[in-house]
């Protein structure tokens, strides 16, 4: 593991006094009962508290809500309860934060049964001032803001109503009824599915996909025989029923619904789903769940079109019951994602790939590391990191992985090292590189956060006793300090730091227990003092991202360039800053066949990097041409990786072939190809095509 | 002390052929890929070659591609250009270069150089 | 390839004096590259890697800036000892390629 506190740790001098100085303590007049806690707008330093203590009597529930605000990143709060009337809020609405900096927050009260409609609080001063607005209708969901103007909203009704508000909240109108999803997209559009049947649940795969570009003067069909739809990058997908009413399959459309082409994968049953588990404006990682209860399936790559997909990864790990997924996009660095499979002997996996899906490997465990009792040969194993999958089975793992696009090639994790994911006690592991190369951080699990841009780790030992404890590291969690930060420990419930990892400062949140009563309690860290100076041009050095072989004159090369980035050295302590922007250096490299992904028709045999034309096509293959128009249906047998910037190099040019004759398909009747019947999908929730959970871009 | 020293330089004909060597000395000489520059009188310079620590990466100049073979030896410390089908512009001095031990990295260490004249 | 251009080719300098000496690539090349100075009759020797740092016993006079596709080479106060011919030298992408030098006279 890294050197403990004793061996060449001493970086921080006197950071005891410092840290002392820049600690602050806040007693919420709380009983305890839940707490969450939003930031409003980036760098202003503006948290909201919300506290809620709920009695559930049999007929209605009696509680409490106390607002508190802070505009100094947590070290002191106001009570501002009766800007809010004393009103109860419901939590399951949380607190809607606006867009951006837009300083807008909105706030669900809870009213009685018999009223008409419900009531929000809304403020668009950074939560100095809030306006009581009662609402013609009982939402259901949070409101939801526009990405373009925060000052449209769009909710749904208990009896399944579209709202849309202009005027942030103020007035409202309907303008659908029997909604049963809704999304805003690009542009101030909004896309929902509507029965007009009037049944959301009985009735998915006969919705309709509709779309307003007006706020709801006018509407679109834009597809039909819809079972659920989403939204990525630059994306619209739908998983529509087929002919005979058994089977879905996606289809997608780059022109919000304008057109659609059926995407070249395997149709799924009622007993299935499909889920995007990422997407950008330049392509998208679809997951298709396997038959029967397997609690797998297999990843796929689309191309830029979205239509023609690559296999990426088979038994990727996805519980068909929870809807668990292990599968995280690394961000702070290009390219990275790591998932689980489950392997043929039932035990769980990690695996990792470099470039963005094309390959998955094994994550090399730490250097100096021993292989655990899952282990088959004592020498040879792999670092096994816990995720989603490892939390919804009730493992002792308090937190996903952790990176930041800002703090380059950092990557933080729980984990174990063998040949698969262990039940045993994990510790805390940490890559500097992106998850090339890993080391053992800290022993036993721990809550981990990143502050100014990587320049500080600070962590808090997982324990069912109370801690006063907390670990901080300068070096990317090589060394580890610790600092006693209240004499009298509390029971933790959590770290909270400003999204976006820039901040200096730390909250650590618990709550105290005596006799009779146990209260909210907050620390609030800040580091500024430990970090004395600011950043200076030579406490960088060049890190050239992906290197794995220096003398290749390829190194790095990943989606056809390659990227040198400034970083901090480890030795320097200073402060990277709050304006801190990544210095990163892009270099076209050659192209080579690896750049190139198989067209529509063309595969590519196993250990050969070649694409060949398949002998005929046949199967779901066809589905893909259904809807195709010609230039859909001419191509070199190649097509560029979405995102590939190679130039020169391996330029492979095949015949032109017109793959129009091989196209015969009654997947469905030729008189259905219209943009109402070859649409989108939508849905209301539920197990199958989750388009929604944890960060999963869409899941049916 | 590091140190490069080339050899094998003279004057030949067009369409002979010559073999220059480079004895490293005061450095791991097996954990460094390694490099032919070359600068025509009173020219600028122009790289020629370059080979990896195991001899895995091989790349040459388009100039030279077909006609000279690099090649080294661990074991002797020593870095090896055959040149065949010289031709009147091949005609320079020749240096031996190590490339530091980083990706993209810069030519650390140089030799004295050798002249080769191509001439009838 | 790469063409890197360096300028001014030609540069009569009294001592004392601040030498800039700019190289331009034909595309982003990031930090890759090099500075070498070859004096004459003599082979070259490296001043400045990775288009900013100093390589062990060059004297502090020389410095380095820039990244992506243009960059410099400065020296600070010159001395009689630095007239020599100044190469730039890519290693970003193959062929490797050097600029066509910059000769530094001592007035």
């Known amino acids: 593991s890294a050197p403990g506190e004793d061996e060449e740790c001493g970086r921080v001098r006197d950071f005891v006094a410092k840290l002392a100085n820049n600690t602050h303590q806040h007693v919420f007049d709380d009983l305890r009962g839940s707490v969450s806690l939003s930031w409003v707008g980036d760098s202003t330093g503006v948290i909201l508290v919300l506290t809620t203590f709920h009695v559930p009597l049999v007929i209605m529930t009696f509680g409490q809500s106390k607002l508190y605000r802070s505009e100094d990143y947590g070290k002191n709060f106001k009570d501002i309860t009766d800007l809010i009337n004393n009103t109860f809020i419901r939590t399951e609405f949380g607190m809607a934060i606006g867009p951006e900096n837009s300083g807008k927050v909105v706030l669900t009260a809870e009213v009685s049964g018999g009223s008409r409609g419900g009531r929000i609080f809304r403020s668009s001063d950074f939560a100095k001032n809030f306006v009581q607005t009662d609402l013609p209708f009982h939402p259901l969901t949070q409101m939801m803001y526009s990405p373009q103007n925060s000052d449209y909203l769009l909710a749904l009704s208990t009896e399944n109503g579209l709202w849309v508000s202009k005027n942030f909240g103020g007035k409202w109108e309907e303008i659908h009824k029997t909604v049963c999803l809704a999304k805003w997209g690009r542009k101030g559009t909004i896309f929902f599915t509507a029965n007009h049947n009037g049944s959301c649940s009985n009735d998915r795969g006969m919705l309709e996909l509709e779309r307003t570009t007006d706020y709801g003067k006018s509407f679109k069909t834009v597809a039909s025989k819809i079972y659920s739809f989403g939204l990525g990058g630059k994306f619209l997908f739908a998983s529509v029923m087929t002919g005979k009413g058994t089977l879905r399959a996606i289809h997608v459309s780059v022109d919000d619904g304008d057109t659609w082409n059926m995407a070249q994968l395997p149709p799924v049953g009622h007993e299935q789903f499909y889920s995007i588990l990422a997407a950008n404006d330049e392509m998208v990682f679809m997951h298709v769940d396997e038959p029967g209860d397997s609690g797998f399936g297999t990843i796929y790559v689309s191309d830029d079109r979205g239509t023609v997909y690559s296999k990426s990864l088979e038994r990727h790990l996805y519980t068909t019951t929870g809807g668990e997924t292990d599968f995280i996009n690394v961000t702070s660095l290009r390219g990275v994602f790591t998932t689980s499979i489950l392997a043929e002997d039932k035990s769980v996996q990690s695996v990792i790939s470099f470039d963005q899906g094309g390959e998955w490997v094994p994550l090399r465990k730490p250097a100096d590391s021993k292989c655990d009792a899952t282990a088959r040969d004592p020498e040879k194993c792999s670092l096994h990191i816990h995720a989603a999958y490892s939390i919804a089975t009730g493992l002792n793992v308090p937190m996903l992985p952790l990176s930041e696009p800002n703090a380059v090639g950092l990557v933080l994790a729980h984990g174990s090292v063998g040949d698969a994911i262990s039940v045993m006690r994990p510790d805390v592991y940490v890559s500097d590189d992106g998850g090339y190369t890993w080391i053992k951080a800290l022993e036993g699990p721990h809550y981990y956060t990143i502050l100014d841009s990587g320049g500080i780790i600070v962590a808090i030992e997982h324990s069912s006793r109370p801690i006063n404890v907390i670990k901080f590291s300068t070096d990317e969690g090589q060394c580890w300090q610790t600092y006693t930060f209240t004499r009298d420990p509390i029971y933790f419930t959590g770290l909270a730091s400003e999204p976006g990892a820039r901040s200096m400062n730390i909250s650590i949140w618990g709550f105290t227990e005596s006799f009779l009563t146990s209260q909210w309690v907050s620390y609030t860290i800040d580091f500024k003092d430990i970090l004395e100076r600011n950043c200076e041009e030579k406490d960088y050095t060049i890190w050239l991202a992906h290197s794995t072989d220096p003398e290749d004159y390829e190194d790095g090369c990943i989606l056809g360039y390659k990227e040198q980035f400034l970083r901090l050295r480890k030795s320097s302590v200073c402060q990277n800053g709050r304006d801190y922007v990544v210095t990163k250096q892009p270099s076209i490299c050659l192209c080579s066949l690896e750049d190139f992904l198989c067209d529509f028709g063309y595969y590519r045999p196993e250990n050969d990097s070649k694409c060949v034309e398949q002998p005929e096509l046949k199967g779901h293959d066809l589905e893909f041409c259904l809807y195709g128009r010609e230039e859909h249906l001419t191509t070199n047998g190649y097509r560029k990786i979405p995102g590939d910037k190679c130039q020169g190099g391996v330029n492979p040019v095949r015949e032109v072939k017109d793959l129009k004759k091989k196209c015969t398909s009654n997947f469905l009747s030729p008189e259905k190809q219209n943009s109402k019947s070859n649409g989108s999908a939508g849905g209301s929730g539920g197990l199958n095509d989750i388009f929604e959970a944890q960060k999963i871009e869409w899941h049916e | 002390e590091v140190q490069l020293v080339e050899s094998g330089g003279g004057l030949v004909k067009p369409g002979g052929s010559l073999r220059l060597s480079c004895a490293a000395s005061?450095?791991?000489?097996?954990?460094?890929?390694m490099n032919w520059v070359r600068q025509a009188p009173g020219k600028g310079l122009e790289w020629v070659s370059s080979?990896?620590?195991?001899?895995?990466?091989?790349y040459y100049a388009d100039s030279v591609k077909g006609r000279f073979t690099i090649s080294r030896d661990n074991a002797k410390n020593s870095l090896y250009l055959q040149m065949n089908s010289l031709r009147a512009e091949d005609t320079a001095v020749y240096y031996c270069?190590?490339?530091?031990?980083?990706?993209?990295?810069?030519?650390?260490?140089w030799g004295q150089g050798t002249m080769v004249t191509v001439s009838s | 390839e790469i063409v890197l251009t360096q300028s001014p080719d030609f540069q009569s300098v009294t001592p004392k004096e601040k030498v800039t000496i700019t190289c331009r690539a034909s595309?982003?090349?990031?930090?890759?590259l090099h500075w070498y100075q070859q004096k004459p009759d003599q082979s070259p020797k490296l001043l400045i890697k990775?288009?900013?740092q100093s390589f062990s016993g060059v004297p502090s006079r020389f410095s380095g800036s820039g990244s992506g596709t243009d960059f410099t080479l400065t020296i600070n106060s010159l001395e009689a000892e630095d007239a020599a011919a100044y190469y730039c030298?890519?290693?970003?992408?193959?062929?490797?390629?050097f600029g066509g030098g910059t000769k530094v006279e001592i007035k």
């Open positions: 270069a190590r490339r530091g031990s980083g990706s993209y990295d810069a030519f650390d260490i």
């Open positions: 005061g450095f791991t000489f097996s954990s460094y890929s």
């Open positions: 080979i990896s620590s195991s001899s895995s990466y091989i």
């Open positions: 595309q982003s090349i990031g930090y890759s």
């Open positions: 990775y288009a900013s």
């Open positions: 030298h890519q290693s970003s992408s193959l062929p490797l390629t």
